[in-house]
Amino acid sequence: ETDEEPEEPGRRGSFVEMVDNLRGKSGQGYYVEMTVGSPPQTLNILVDTGSSNFAVGAAPHPFLHRYYQRQLSSTYRDLRKGVYVPYTQGKWEGELGTDLVSIPHGPNVTVRANIAAITESDKFFINGSNWEGILGLAYAEIARPDDSLEPFFDSLVKQTHVPNLFSLQLCGAGFPLNQSEVLASVGGSMIIGGIDHSLYTGSLWYTPIRREWYYEVIIVRVEINGQDLKMDCKEYNYDKSIVDSGTTNLRLPKKVFEAAVKSIKAASSTEKFPDGFWLGEQLVCWQAGTTPWNIFPVISLYLMGEVTNQSFRITILPQQYLRPVEDVATSQDDCYKFAISQSSTGTVMGAVIMEGFYVVFDRARKRIGFAVSACHVHDEFRTAAVEGPFVTLDMEDCGYNIPQTDESTLMT
């Protein structure tokens, strides 16, 4: 149930060269430095476990400081194929090719990988985010234009001896960072090919990857301050639940969001917060250093365990789901945005969840591990937690089966 069983050599221990290789912040994403082409062109690349394309800015854009210049790379190969990726809001499109790619603060290897050279985009790049591309770490099934385009991590594992696993420690600052602070700050670690003991405390608990497309998991129970939301567990996973480092918030299906907000409101009713706060529109502020963390409840998500009828729970604090925001107009106060929001595409365990935990994406064994992060923000009274085992029956029933039709693969 935990990680105490022996592992093959090279899977565990110290990965000093990869520790602290991420920068950024939850609101704009965490990025790693990568090099592309020959001679190498250095770019900052968003680490995104919610998509599967390696895509980089390849043309001038007002929000990009630099971009991939294919014509300067002697190792670039054009695949003579376009790619178009629409989102609910925004899109990017580009041209497919391959080139040599490496991660300076990663494994000491170079791989030939598919690259989408982004030539046009809308609502994709973020002004001031300091990243110029995206590293989609999920599976080929959701790669664009189709699942024949091998994702970067698959290429890495196939072409090298790097074990088929990576782990992420995203470190929320607990206070707002200005642009220069972000550039100078440590954002966390992406350990490629292994697990670093120094990045977590306690035990790792694993949940099965339900299906290899997104990193899909199954939530079997939700509690607010220990009070069960008492919903049919299918609602928690309607239409899926995924772990996504490229999303800021904890996003919940409509019914679950409404029930959770109702419960959080009730637990924190000693203060009257505006409706706009729960919508993510209004900030709430307190005099510097006086944020009443204690009035806000902890949130526990119970995840399916590796053993039949066994689950474990991950618990986050308000320090994770209240996101610090700097606003010049209220700079004398500590201000926060509510970082739980409504979703029409299922539960998304974004940065606000991941910032509490060291998360192991054990692709080799089709499972995701959670342990308390050594860098999570907490106070002297409460800490994030990963605890188990708990007996939970009929967990398979909690998964939602998305209707498959012939047309479904055409949907975007």
Epitope: K123, I126, K272, A329
Partner: antibody, heavy 116, light 107 residues
Framework: EVQLQQSGAELVRPGTSVKLSCKAS?????SYWIHWVKQRPGQGLEW???????????KYNQKFKDKATLTVDTSSSTTYMHLSSLTSEDSAVYYC?????????WGQRTLVTVSA | DIQMTQSQKFMSKSVGDRVSVTCKAS??????VAWYQQKSGQSPKSLIY???HRYSGVPDRFTGSGSGTDFTLTISNVQSEDLADYFC?????????FGGGTRLEIK
């Protein structure tokens, strides 16, 4: 420095429509909602609605839901308000404002005059 | 909708005086009230949020108080540049609503 730059005054005919703009600068555009407020002489301030630039989600005052349409263009950090089927009642000064706690920042005003 | 009532439409004060502008909400809005100053021909300027917190850069002669349904903006040591309309706003629930305004005239 946070700035909201609104488009210039408009003189329009009854029954037509107009599109006002509000260009934001000095902050991360997608991090804060933009509101629109109407002010008629002697009638105080009226909240029209708001838009979240990160996903174009909108919320309107019921009174204005058939009158105003809010849109956003993140590539230019600009929010738009389209006012339709204009009448003399729509003659007013319009403001955009940025959220935070209440409305800490306001645009400089756009005067709309509806006249035959 | 929540009504915000500023019963005094006009107030006339001399430089150096203290003035209190009041605002009443039709239902409990907690501390979710802001105050704005609007000078002739200009946009509103934000003064107070959360009923009693001054926005950055606002002189400390402006203070806000109240919670629930009754709110007050106090200007101590009134200056000639304080000649303006003052509006309260509730941002507790949608639709956001404003008071009708109080004009401060300087004698």
């Amino acid at each position: 420095e946070v700035q909201l730059q609104q488009s210039g005054a408009e003189l329009v005919r009854p029954g037509t429509s107009v599109k006002l703009s509000c260009k934001a600068s000095g902050y991360t555009f997608t991090s804060y909602w933009i509101h629109w407020v109407k002010q008629r002489p002697g009638q105080g301030l009226e909240w029209i609605g708001m838009i979240d630039p990160s996903d174009s989600y909108t919320k309107y005052n019921q009174k204005f839901k058939d009158k105003a349409t809010l849109t956003v263009d993140t590539s230019s950090s600009t929010t738009y308000m389209h006012l339709s089927s204009l009448t003399s009642e729509d003659s007013a000064v319009y403001y955009c404002a940025r959220s935070g706690v209440a409305f800490p920042y306001w645009g400089q005003r756009t005067l709309v005059t509806v006249s035959a | 909708d929540i009504q915000m009532t500023q019963s005094q439409k006009f107030m006339s004060k001399s430089v150096g005086d203290r003035v209190s502008v009041t605002c009443k909400a039709s239902q409990n809005v907690g501390s979710n009230v802001a105050w704005y100053q609007q000078k002739s021909g200009q946009s509103p300027k934000s003064l107070i949020y959360s009923a009693s917190h001054r926005y950055s850069g606002v002189p400390d002669r402006f203070t806000g108080s109240g919670s629930g349904t009754d709110f007050t903006l106090t200007i101590s040591n009134v200056q000639s540049e304080d000649l303006a309309d003052y509006f309260c706003q509730q941002y507790n629930s949608y639709p956001y609503t404003f008071g009708g305004g109080t004009r401060l005239e300087i004698k």
